[in-house]
Structures are given as C-alpha cells and as structure tokens.
C-alpha cells in the first residue's frame, strides 16, 4: 500500500473505483457500472453516474411543467445507454425492446416506441430552470447575497463558469435558478449545465456525489439555507415531439 | 518536498524546446494541479498552462500560449511543457509549482521550484 | 478578467505598516492568495482563500477582503519584508486570461 494508492481518489465521483495503473503509473479512475475511465478535476456526466447508481435504485420522481415545452424527469431512474464520452445516446430502450429519445440530459423527449423507433441526434438541452423552496426564515434572504451565493456555489462545487448561470430569481420561499448554455457557448472543459443541476439535485437530496465531503451547506451571510424541494424543468434547443394524447 | 525544472537555456528564434518538472518526496498522482508560471527578466509573473495530475489530464492555457505551448503529464513524476516558434519576448524564467486543492477554480500555488531560465536570441 | 494591484511601488521604515491593494474586474469569491517574492527566488505564498495565513508566515501578514477589493496589510516591517508582492487568482483560468497581480514593490528604510 504506497503513498500514491492514498493519493489516487476521485474527489468529484464517490462511484468510482481508482488505482496507480494509468499511463506511467499515474491514478486512473473507473466509474462503476461501466468501467469507463472519468475526469476527476471535473464532474462527470450525468449518464455515467446514472449508470452506476443503477446498483442501488431509488424510488422514480414526478415533476410538473411549466410550460408546453418543458421536460421534467417523470419517467424516474433507468439504466442509460452512453457513449465513449460519457453522454446519453440519443436513444434508449429498455429490456424488453421499448426505445424513446432523450435530450443531452437524459430525459425522454418522445413518445416510447419499438426498436424500429430513430432519434437522429442528441438534442441539446440549453436552458434549466431549477425551482427550489426554502424551508421558513425570520426574513427573507437579500436577493443580491442569496444571487452571490448560488453563483458561488455552482462555481466553486461545481466548476460551472459564472457566465452559465443566467440569473436568480427569488420569492420568498421560493427560488429559482436559471442555468443557460447553447451548443455554440459551451467550450471544450466547460463544465455542462445538465451535470451541474444533477450534482445540485443530488446534494439537495442529502445523496453527494463528492468523494468525503461533507453535504451540502448552504449559507447566506450565515444563515442557513434548507431546501424543502426542488423541481428541475429542462428546455431543449428543440422543442420535444409528443402525440396529443400525451397531452391531454 | 521539492521541485525543480530542467531543459533551460539558450534557444534561436523560431526555435522549440522542452522543459521538465520534476517532483521528490511526493507523487505525481495526486489529486491535484500542476502549473507553468513564467517571469521576464524585471517583469511580473504570468500563467501559461495547467494540468490536473490525478485521473483525467484536463488542462487549461493562458489565451496567448493555446497552440504555442503543451503541457502534459506521461509519468507520476514529471511534468512537461513544450514550446515552439519561440521569440525573444518569450525569454523568461519558467518555474513549475503545485496546486493546493484538486479544484482549479480555488488554486493557489503551496510549493514552487527554483525555475529555470530561457534566453530567446540568435 | 483583469487583476489590478496598487501601488506597484511603496516604501516605509522599519517597524511602519504597508497595505497593498488588488482588485479583481470580477466577483472571485473569496479566491485570493498573495506571494512574496525576493529577486533570485521563486514566490512564496503568504496568504489563501483571502485571509488564511500559510504555514510558518508570521501573522504580522494579514489578508482581507472578498469579492472584488482585497487587501494585504503587512505591519511591525522588517528588513526581511523588502520583496515584491503579488496577488493572484485563479477563479477564471478558464477564460485563458493571467490570475496574477502587476506586484507591489516593498522597499523597507
């Protein structure tokens, strides 16, 4: 046991498996489920995680819409089929040959079909909007504090660059975070939108990805910030194609 | 715990070199940044490039030094930055040093090595 | 992004108290750290995280300071202060831009 197998861990991914056998005896880490080698300066992608969270399955979510167009994650955990760079394949299907198409973070965007079903491209899911309650206060936060301290927060946990979260909104209880990335704005490195909102959703939950950190502690100007729920509404660059009959 | 580069020294214009960083008393796969970090002669510091040395190899570059210099890491105990089509604006001291935490965003550099010098003339 | 140090030069007698400023054109949070460093030598950190005091410095260094306007107050001067400053983040290494401060020369009588 040497000082480099101590060193070699995944800060940013607890599912993960890591030892000094990478190029030159350097660390290398293996997200579970797929064995697919991940970046541990970074956040790994929302696929990847999903894949090896399929070993201990929670409980499915229903979120609502806000509006005709946008995606909420109705259809709970599956296990994600991911290409070599950890994103979602355009399109998924189960065990028993049932296939729909996914946007860039995983959600369903079509009606569920069979394995004749085409999804021609992964379509890009540029703007999430993460609508949190708080638990009650004495007084509301400052509006300009609790802004400072989401960007914060999405910067220095999340590695997301301040120019993605697009703005803060606030009524008391409730707040909302507006993340926005085009395909055009996202540069190689950049941490994407659909990542960070996934590592935030799970932080909420009290379920960290991050290797032996402490849960999430949100602070404004010291006063603790809980959150009571999260719904996560996610628009695609491409509206999603539903038959009426989903609609109605 | 020390570091110390090589490969310095005199270069003709247009010319190319390869500066080594070696670390000793610790590992190379930690999880955290190493940095090249260059001064001119009475001038201040200025960053060329990173690269995390844990799982990964991610790396950032200073605007002005993307295509100019790559920096990477083959072993747990050097890293390496290349350079090309050198000028006389581009001699300077060149240290490497250490990140203190794994998250590039919140780095500051605990641990430095002597530098080595690069003189860009004919 | 820009780190803007002031003054880039000062000069106070022993036992005096200097303060160098550096402002970033951005909010970094509380991501600052501040080096000394002496002609010859590589830098030597002082200061992280704004304020935090790095092993062995003597606290007659102080960091203040957060958002944009930070501050390094160095009092009780010594013979052994005389070196150049500089402040430094790294908060948008991704915008390819140079974290570092124009230093601050600190010359002791």
């Known amino acids: 046991h040497t000082a480099a197998q101590d060193n070699c861990t995944c800060p940013t991914n607890k599912m993960t498996v890591c030892s000094p056998d990478g190029p030159g005896g350097r660390c290398q880490c293996r997200a579970l489920g797929s064995g697919v080698a991940v970046d541990c300066s970074t956040l790994t992608s929302k696929c990847l995680l999903l894949k090896a969270r399929m070993s201990a399955p929670k409980n499915a979510r229903t979120l609502v819409r806000p509006n005709e167009h946008a995606l909420v994650d109705n259809d709970g955990l599956y296990d994600p089929d991911c290409d070599p760079e950890g994103r979602f394949k355009a399109r998924q299907c189960n065990q028993t040959s049932v296939c729909w198409c996914v946007n860039s973070v995983g959600v369903r965007r079509t009606d569920k079909g069979d394995l004749s079903l085409r999804c021609d491209e992964l379509v890009r899911t540029h703007h999430i909007l993460i609508d949190l309650r708080h638990r009650p206060t004495a007084s509301a936060f400052n509006h300009s504090d609790l802004d400072a301290e989401l960007r914060r927060l999405f910067r220095e946990r999340y590695r997301l660059h301040p120019k993605f979260v697009a703005a803060v909104h606030y009524e008391q209880p409730t707040i909302q975070i507006e993340l926005r990335q085009n395909t055009s704005q996202k540069a190689a490195g950049d941490v994407d939108i659909g990542d960070a909102a996934y590592y935030f959703e799970r932080d909420v939950k009290g379920e960290s990805l991050f290797q032996g950190r402490g849960g999430l502690d949100l602070r404004v100007r010291g006063e603790p910030l809980q959150v009571e729920r999260t719904l996560i509404y996610y628009l695609d660059e491409i509206p999603p194609k539903f038959s009426m009959k989903r609609l109605t | 715990q020390q570091l110390e580069e090589s490969g310095g020294g005199l270069v003709k214009p247009e010319g190319s070199l390869t500066l080594t960083c070696k670390g000793s008393?610790?590992?190379?796969?930690?999880?955290?940044w190493m940095w090249w970090v260059r001064q001119a002669p009475g001038k201040g510091l200025e960053w060329i490039a990173?690269?995390?040395?844990?799982?990964?190899?991610?790396t950032y570059y200073a605007s002005w030094a993307k295509g100019r210099f790559t920096i990477s890491s083959t072993s747990s105990t050097a890293v390496t930055l290349q350079a090309t089509s050198l000028t006389a604006a581009d001699t300077a001291t060149y240290f490497c040093a250490r990140g203190a935490t794994n998250n590039v965003f919140m780095n500051y550099f605990n641990l430095w090595g002597p530098g080595t010098l690069v003189t860009v003339s004919s | 992004f820009e780190m803007t140090q002031t003054p880039s030069s000062v000069s106070e007698p022993v036992g005096g108290t200097v303060t160098i400023k550096c402002q970033a054109s951005e909010d970094i949070s509380s991501n600052l750290g501040w080096y000394q460093q002496k002609p010859g030598q590589p830098p030597k950190l002082l200061i992280y995280g704004a304020s935090t005091l790095a092993s062995g410095v003597p606290s007659r260094f102080k960091g203040s300071g957060s958002g944009t306007e930070f501050t390094l107050t160095i009092s009780d001067l010594e013979c052994a202060d005389a070196a150049t400053y500089y402040c430094q983040t790294s908060y948008y290494i991704d915008d390819g831009v140079n974290g570092f401060g124009g230093g601050t020369e600190v010359v002791v009588k």
């Open positions: 990173c690269i995390y040395v844990g799982s990964g190899s991610s």
């Open positions: 008393g610790f590992d190379f796969s930690g999880t955290y």
